[in-house]
Amino acid sequence: SDKLYQRKEPVISSVHTKVKGIAEVTENVTEGGVTKLGHSIFDTADYTFPLQGNSFFVMTNYVKSEGQVQTLCPEYPRRGAQCSSDRRCKKGWMDPQSKGIQTGRCVPYDKTRKTCEVSAWCPTEEEKEAPRPALLRSAENFTVLIKNNIHFPGHNYTTRNILPTMNGSCTFHKTWDPQCSIFRLGDIFQEAGENFTEVAVQGGIMGIEIYWDCNLDSWSHHCRPRYSFRRLDDKNTDESFVPGYNFRYAKYYKENNVEKRTLIKAFGIRFDILVFGTGGKF
């Protein structure tokens, strides 16, 4: 309830997160023209990436372009990229949709198609669909510990969401354990009314809202957080127009003195932690 006699002050906050969990990934691996099932283990260092501000990212799916080398090769024949003669290819041209710089030559991509040759990381990335179901769909069972320190400078009051009495093995539950600051990712989605398995394919953005409504008067002191969750990206975006959340990164290595890279298009959930609230004192 609004106490008009109190002096209110907005919260100043800092957030630190720690994600835990292991995923086993089974995918098709092609070596020397032979495709077989490959098994790999993903730990925190493999699927989380440091982000700026009050955010963390968990990779739930990926598409790899392995063994790329800087050389010349045909551009991937995406829509509008095919050619029939060199006239269609402009030397030095960098098409924003392309993955390289055109050499001016129209060359065979495969048996039936020709595309402009580019100087690029080759072979250029194919336009592949994100795997369905998501490769790291078991990320649903990962947990995140959220440490949230807050401060009201005008009232000279500081506290945090983690209490000394808290059990390190607890898991947040809206009813049974609303003060536990360890959250199962699947539960976050369930609370927000979203399907983790579905969002994991293309990625998305999930908001974790921490609301502090603090009464700092000594006779009726109360200052504990309330957690709520909601999806922040537009899930209704037309499928053809950049759905979900993804980015690319590369792992570089040398093989026979040739610099190579594996390009990874990572799909996943960016969790934005939004802290707001006020502290009131007479």
Epitope: V69, T71, L72, C73, R105, P108, Y109, E117
Partner: nanobody
Framework: EVQLVESGGGLVQAGGSLRLSCAAS?????MGWFRQAPGKEREFVAG????????RYADSVKGRFTISRDNAKNTVSLQMSGLKPEDTAIYYC???????????WGQGTQVTVSS
């Protein structure tokens, strides 16, 4: 799938020359040669992009082997000179998407260099 047929292998004396040829069933961006000596892994020898641009050679054959292409005929040749006994191997023709990346290989042709 691209079909590749190699020819030109044989027995030659050290210091001699040999020319290998390969015909592909369809046009392809890059064509190249690999070799495999007994008890060793298959290794890259030489590769050529479309119209012979770019070309790439293994350090061990630079200055001795020359790769050339005929796009119109979908063929690639490997002119080998100054042959050494360590060049003895089965030579495979290959096609791919760049001079570093190959998907299809032929059956191979034997080259033996005697000392």
């Amino acid at each position: 799938e691209v079909q590749l047929v190699e020819s030109g292998g044989g027995l030659v004396q050290a210091g001699g020359s040999l020319r290998l040829s390969c015909a592909a069933s369809e046009r392809t961006y890059s064509m190249g040669w690999f070799r495999q000596a007994p008890g060793k892994e298959r290794e890259f020898v030489a590769g050529s992009g479309w119209d012979g641009i770019p070309t790439r050679y293994a350090d061990s054959v630079k200055g001795r082997f020359t790769i050339s292409r005929d796009n119109a005929k979908n063929t690639v040749s490997l002119q080998m000179s100054g042959l050494k006994p360590e060049d003895t191997a089965i030579y495979y023709c290959a096609t791919g998407t760049s001079v570093y990346h190959y998907q299809y290989w032929g059956q191979g042709t034997q080259v033996t260099v005697s000392s």
